[in-house]
Interface confidence: medium
């Protein structure tokens, strides 16, 4: 069965730093999402080989990719306190498959000692239920994204 290996399980970084999240699969997928979990889960990126990735508005200009969709490293730069959360990879295959999640703790530099990752991976209960709709990939454009400006600022 298809699996998604995700690392690290947890990382603590100061504000302004960067973090790498790696999602590895055995291949045979259409594309891969990175999602931020929580009360209101959000799609952060969608990556598919050969097309331009889509990236959430909050991370526009702060995301780099290396590797391929089968072994993808996502680098999030200039982290903010509000970026703290659990991020999970989702491989789009015949059956959607989730990684174990990465807990990213973004801290003020002076308070890092109070916020440390344990060695335990994020609890499975933190993972989302599979989306209700299908999630088949398609060609991408480079913009996109949630947490947009108020409607009055829209064109």
């Amino acid at each position: 069965a298809q699996e998604v290996q995700q690392s690290p399980h947890c990382t603590t970084v100061p504000v302004g730093a960067s973090v790498n999240i790696t999602c590895s699969t055995s291949g045979g997928l259409r594309g891969i999402y990175l999602r931020q979990l929580g009360p209101q889960p959000q799609d952060i990126i969608y990556y598919e080989d050969g097309v331009v990735p889509t990236t959430d508005r909050r991370f526009r200009g702060r995301i780099d990719f290396s590797g391929s969709q089968d072994n993808l490293t996502i680098t999030m730069h200039r982290l903010q306190l509000s970026d703290t959360g659990t991020y999970t990879c989702q491989a789009i295959t015949e059956v959607n498959v989730y990684g174990s999640g990465t807990l990213v703790l973004v801290t003020e530099e002076q308070s890092q000692g109070w916020h440390r990752c344990s060695d335990a991976p994020p609890r499975a209960s933190a993972l989302p239920a599979p989306p209700t709709g299908s999630a088949l990939p398609d060609p991408q454009t480079a913009s996109a994204l949630p947490d947009p400006p108020a409607a009055s600022a829209l064109p």
Epitope: P41, P139, Q140
Partner: nanobody, 124 residues
Amino acid sequence: QVQLQESGGGLVQPGGSLRLSCAASGTTLDDYAVGWFRQAPGKEREGVACISASELSTYYADSVKGRFTISRDNAKNTMYLQMNSLKPEDTAVYYCAARVGRIVDVTSTQYQYWGQGTQVTVSS
């Protein structure tokens, strides 16, 4: 090529409800993030509600939060906008749109495919 066709608009009294539908042809909608936009006379087009291809992420304009609900039925290749507690200021032409990209975006220029629009009038 994607073709979109809205339906369900009409005249409704303040406080009433309408359900707009947008049927897609030419491709499957589940490959696209989709949204509803509206344009009132003399005003710019504004984003009302958007939903990602995965259905995980949604966006609602502040003016419609708690009153409007966007949804999609990929089996029927259709998306919907349920509008409750309608107000006169909701009067506008409502457009559905689809974008080549899987994540929600409320910027109208990021949507490549548009319906022709359906008129919604809220008046007593």
